[in-house]
């Protein structure tokens, strides 16, 4: 018969390293007689036999943690007692090793330029992971503005536009590496005007383009204010390139005004705005010269006042040094010449000359003059003023000038567009439409070669007819 023997732990417990979710086993080999009762503690607290996270086998000599958690870290002891002598104990540590894990990853951030940005990156792991950051495809270097905090977070002081981009944090220890998702740092910049509109001094009826350029992130919107109110007329063209918005306000100037460009962008719930203003003033009429070809303005002379439509814009040719005075002088001279012509010819010739010297302006990017329609020119030449024209041509051939029409700035009809080819290419003379309806007999045209384009003026029932009171349509 065996002699009783007090328990002896033959294999003392050792420190066990285990990875989370893996199995960890402590072995406590005991020699004794009779067989001992073996109990286990963790941090001096008894491990219950029915705790399903553990498995105790080999008469209690083997403790297995079935799926290690990071909270299982601690000191595990086995205590053997068989009633012979005192209980014996052996202890060992469980060190839960853990691959890096990012518990609070960074998130997308929008930040205003100049402020401080913090991108969080809280980690777990054993050994404690080191944290570094990647921007785009490159490791981020720390500097006086950019630092990785003890917590792993990235702090950027005085955020600059170039800090914008995609970031990720990297947690690393001896067991592995964890990467956060890519997050975007967006740097927002208050709206700022790069190019303010310039003030202009222009002629009445001129077109002016005010240009305003602004930058910001997000790209600002530009609005225009005229004398404190939203711009009521004019057209706005906008283009955006590299976060710069370029707005051009084209105006048809009929009154002076203060035009303000307002650049606005939004940062969360708040807006930032920048403003710049320009004045548009109206110059002295005679001083204005819009461009190399000419400009459009209201007729302010006297000679053609009754012939031209009220408030209509007419073309002034800047090949003259002082277009308005020069053109008025020409028409004034012509008017005196017309005193010598017949009562039938005179009003028709006046209508022709006024509309030829002061051509109607048509809209567009640049105002352009509309010549008289060939048919109306021919009507004057071959119907209303046939005798005068013939006399003038005859005397011109013989070198004699006494007809009263030889000095007139008369258009060359053949060089004028036909309204039958393009009804929108030329100006009609309503006086002639009206007059034609009331003339029963025309002077006979005895010129050697009647024109192939002998005027086919519209009848009053057609869409071309215009009331006599409404000239220059």
């Amino acid at each position: 018969e065996k002699l009783p023997k007090a328990p002896v732990i033959t294999t003392p417990l050792e420190t066990v390293d285990a990875l989370v979710e893996e199995v960890a086993t402590f072995m406590c080999a005991v020699e004794s007689y009779p067989q001992p009762e073996i109990s286990w503690t963790r941090n001096k607290i008894l491990i219950k036999l029915f705790d399903t996270r553990y498995s105790i086998r080999e008469n209690g000599q083997l403790l297995t943690i079935l799926s290690v958690e990071d909270s299982d870290d601690g000191i595990y002891c086995c205590i053997a007692n068989n009633g012979v002598g005192g209980a014996v104990e052996s202890c060992g540590a469980l060190q839960v090793k853990m691959k890096p894990k990012i518990t609070r990853p960074p998130i997308n951030v929008k930040i205003i330029e100049g402020l401080k940005a913090v991108l969080p990156c809280t980690t777990m792991g054993n050994p404690k992971p080191s944290v570094s950051w990647i921007k785009g495809d490159n490791a981020l270097r720390e500097n006086s503005r950019i630092a990785v905090l003890e917590s792993g977070s990235l702090r950027i002081h005085n955020v600059q536009k170039e800090d914008a981009g995609q970031y990720r944090c990297v947690a690393k220890n001896s067991l592995g590496t964890a990467y956060s998702k890519l997050v975007k740092l967006e740097v927002e910049v208050f709206a700022r005007i790069l190019r303010a509109p310039e003030s202009h001094n222009v002629t009445f009826g001129s077109f002016v383009t005010l240009r305003c350029t602004a930058i910001g992130i997000p790209v600002p919107t530009i609005s225009w204010i005229e004398n404190g109110n939203a711009v009521s007329s004019g057209s706005i063209q906008e283009s955006v390139k590299d976060r710069v918005i370029d707005s051009r306000l084209q105006l048809f100037i009929t009154k002076p005004g203060l035009y303000t460009c307002i650049a606005t962008n939004k940062h969360g719930e708040k807006f930032s705005t920048a403003k710049a203003a320009a004045t548009v003033s109206i110059a002295e009429w005679s001083k204005s010269q819009k461009d190399s070809q000419g400009y459009c303005a209201q007729y302010r002379g006297e000679v053609c006042d009754a012939v031209l439509a009220k408030d209509a814009l007419v073309f002034f040719n800047t090949s003259y040094r002082d277009p308005e005075d020069a053109q008025e002088l020409l028409i004034h001279t012509a008017w005196n010449e017309l005193k010598a012509v017949s009562p039938l010819c005179r009003p028709a010739a006046e209508a022709l000359l006024c509309n030829h010297l002061f051509q109607e302006c048509s809209p567009g990017v640049v105002p352009t003059p509309m010549p008289i329609c060939r048919e109306y020119c021919l009507a004057v030449k071959e119907l209303f003023c046939a005798k005068e024209w013939q006399a003038m041509e005859g005397k011109a051939h013989r070198g004699l000038y006494r007809s009263g029409m030889h000095l007139l700035p008369v258009p060359e009809c053949s060089k004028l567009p036909s309204m039958h080819r393009d009804p929108t290419a030329c100006t009609r003379l309503p006086y002639l439409d009206y007059k034609k309806e009331n003339i029963t007999t025309f002077p006979s045209i005895t010129s050697s070669r009647p024109s192939a384009d002998i005027p086919n003026l519209p009848a009053s029932t057609s869409s071309f007819a215009v009331s006599p009171a409404y000239s220059m349509t």
């Epitope: 109607e360 302006c361 809209p363 567009p417 080819r421």
Partner: antibody, heavy 115, light 113 residues
Framework: EVQLVESGGGLVQPGGSLSLSCVAS????????MNWVRQAPGKGLEWLSV???????YYADSVKGRFTISRDNVKNTLYLQLNNLKPEDTALYYC?????????WGQGTQVTVSS | DIVMTQSPSSVTASAGERVTINCRSS????????????LNWYQQRLGQSPRLLIY???ARESGVPDRFSGSGSTTNFTLTISSFQPEDAAVYYC?????????FGSGTRLEIK
């Protein structure tokens, strides 16, 4: 009678060039504004360009920098030079007379841009 | 740029019926100097080149039947066919010519019932 006859269309590869011509007759060509308008298969009309009597031109944004309109008043011919062509330029190209309305239209010339 | 919006996109009509097509511009096309609206209407029959019907919003092009009329001002315009005829089946386009680029509307297809 006004006649506008376009030519020069054809099949061209993306990035290629083409020159369209439009011979005008029946009117004094030099006195009138001329336009190009196109129509993609099964689609609507798209105004491309206008040239005035002084050869000042304006273009639609879609073709600015790639297409060039010009005129030869001696030959009574309107041109459209098409560069850096894209598949979306495939269309019937019309030559049109008119200043502020497109008054007389040609029959069109087909341009196909395909690889 | 001035954007042209046409409605409806298609319409069917019986012979003799009155038809209206609408067109809206994103900016005014009324030129204050001469009080003209720079708005045109075109007809394009299947397989044919377009044809000018109306210019300056209400002026009928020569040779266009008087059942076609144009109206409206500033930004809202209408083409009316007072008594639809089978030969009027076509696509109709509006176009602004106030300033380049001279954009067209997307078109209205008019079909016979």
């Amino acid at each position: 009678e006004v006649q506008l006859v376009e030519s020069g269309g054809g099949l061209v590869q993306p990035g290629g060039s083409l020159s369209l011509s439009c011979v005008a007759s029946g009117f004094t060509f030099s006195l009138y504004y001329m336009n190009w308008v196109r129509q993609a298969p099964g689609k609507g009309l798209e105004w491309l360009s206008v040239i005035d009597t002084h050869s000042i031109a304006y273009y639609a944004d879609s073709v600015k920098g790639r297409f060039t309109i010009s005129r030869d008043n001696v030959k009574n011919t309107l041109y459209l030079q098409l560069n850096n062509l894209k598949p979306e330029d495939t269309a019937l190209y019309y030559c049109v007379l008119g200043r502020t309305a497109l008054v007389r239209w040609g029959q069109g010339t087909q341009v196909t841009v395909s690889s | 740029d001035i954007v042209m919006t046409q409605s409806p996109s298609s319409v069917t009509a019986s012979a003799g019926e009155r038809v209206t097509i609408n067109c809206r511009s994103s900016q005014s096309v009324l030129y204050s100097s001469n009080q003209k609206n720079y708005l045109n209407w075109y007809q394009q029959r299947l397989g044919q080149s377009p044809r000018l019907l109306i210019y300056w919003a209400s002026a009928r092009e020569s040779g266009v039947p008087d059942r076609f009329s144009g109206s409206g001002s500033t930004t809202n315009f209408t083409l009316t066919i007072s008594s639809f005829q089978p030969e009027d089946a076509a696509v109709y386009y509006c176009q602004q010519s106030y300033k380049p680029p001279y954009g067209f509307g997307s078109g209205t297809r008019l079909e016979i019932k």
